[in-house]
């Protein structure tokens, strides 16, 4: 699996969306995961709603909400008010059972806003970071999600 | 009607090789795990593997991880067994199941019989 | 890799009666996030394909009859027949799918007195 490198502004939230198959992880929860180290285990930061079919609901541990459409194939992670020690690698995961299957890798950056930097000069504009592997990058608050309530069976 | 029909009973010597089959018929055969099941003669049922055709995506149990390779070729809705190299021990009854994304099995196959004798 | 081990061997039973086949797991197959039992019951009627009868724990499947029912928690489960009929014989399997491999018990085979 490649990385996705995502690019928040500090203090600002961050939304990664994680595509999969919606037929192949039906009846699986989501999670997202913060890897320790390059080869270590990935901790659990918030994982989807315990009732499948509820999963549309947004489910939060801390700054980091998680909310997945299981009809369109879409887990959405918004980390809010980003702050500097929310950089690293995280994972998207499918769960079965005490088993994770890693969806999507990827690489959380953290941009200092140039308004507080003493030594900026001319204001500096990230680029919108490139949306490949299913994952994009908002630089804004997070829009409500309007979902389709999934089918129970 | 949703049907696994696999190939017909092979009697084979040590030492060759051996592709059998389970095709799907009556859904979508690229958005369903399929697993393979082994029983040997009076035994129990032990699971070998998975694969999912929409990708291909295989998951072996570490029993099996080696010895066999499963397959599948969602253009004609067949997944495939094989082997490079049969022992006597492979005989047995191989059944395909249908899974869902949990893995429990709602569809089997009629079974498919290896024999390997010298 | 868990260890599913069920009792008895054998059954006899007597149509009409209630029948009951235990499984035991050497982890528990409870997920405590989801509140699931990964449990399944199989059963392979004589010269038959295996069939599904119970998923996860206790749920029945598409056309089982309600006479089998599935219960237990943690690493202790059962599978009762009541009211056994003829047509029940075979040998029953429970199987594991928490964590992979999945893993089946060594069967019971129930058959009439």
């Known amino acids: 699996l490649n990385t996705t490198v995502l690019q928040g502004m500090a203090g600002q939230s961050l939304r990664v969306s994680c595509t999969y198959d919606a037929l192949k992880h039906w009846g699986r929860r989501k999670a997202w995961c913060r890897q320790l180290g390059e080869e270590g285990p990935c901790q659990r930061v918030v994982s989807t709603h315990g009732v499948w079919l509820l999963a549309f609901l947004k489910k939060r541990n801390g700054s980091t909400v998680i909310a997945d459409d299981t009809l369109a194939g879409t887990v959405t992670i918004t980390l809010k008010n980003l702050q500097a020690g929310d950089a690293g690698l995280y994972q998207c995961q499918s769960l079965r059972g005490r088993e994770a299957e890693v969806l999507q890798k990827v690489l959380v950056e953290v941009l200092e806003d140039p308004l507080d930097d003493q030594d900026a000069g001319d204001l500096w504009v990230p680029e919108e970071s490139s949306s490949f592997e299913g994952a994009q990058v908002e630089h804004s608050t997070s829009r409500n999600q309007e979902t389709s309530f999934p089918p129970t069976s | 009607e949703v049907q696994l029909v696999q190939s017909g009973s092979e009697v084979k010597k040590p030492g060759e090789s051996l592709r059998i089959s389970c095709k799907g018929s009556g859904y979508s055969f690229s958005s369903y795990w399929l697993a393979w099941v082994r029983q040997m003669p009076g035994k129990g049922l032990e699971w070998m593997g998975i694969?999912?055709?929409?990708?291909?995506?295989?998951r072996y149990s570490p029993s099996f991880q080696g010895q066999v390779t499963i397959s599948a070729d969602k253009s004609i809705s067949t997944a495939y067994l094989q082997w490079s190299s049969l022992k006597a021990s492979d005989t047995a009854m191989y059944y395909c199941a249908r899974g869902t994304p949990l893995f429990y099995f709602t569809y089997w196959g009629q079974g498919t019989l290896v024999t390997v004798s010298s | 890799d868990i260890v599913m081990t069920q009792t008895p061997l054998s059954l006899p039973v007597t149509p009409g009666e209630t029948a009951s086949i235990s499984c035991r797991s050497s982890?528990?197959?409870?997920?405590?996030?989801?509140?699931?039992?990964?449990l399944d019951w199989y059963l392979q009627k004589p010269g038959q394909s295996p069939q599904l009868l119970i998923y996860?724990?206790?749920y029945r499947a598409s056309g089982v009859p309600d006479r089998f029912s599935g219960s237990g928690s943690g690493t202790d489960f059962t599978l009762k027949i009541s009211r056994v009929e003829a047509e029940d014989v075979g040998v029953y399997y429970c199987?594991?799918?928490?964590?992979?491999?999945?893993?089946f018990g060594g069967g019971t085979k129930v058959e009439i007195k």
């Open positions: 199987m594991q799918r928490i964590e992979s491999p999945l893993t």
């Open positions: 996860t724990l206790s």
């Open positions: 982890q528990s197959l409870l997920d405590s996030e989801d509140g699931n039992t990964y």
């Open positions: 694969i999912y055709p929409g990708d291909s995506d295989t």
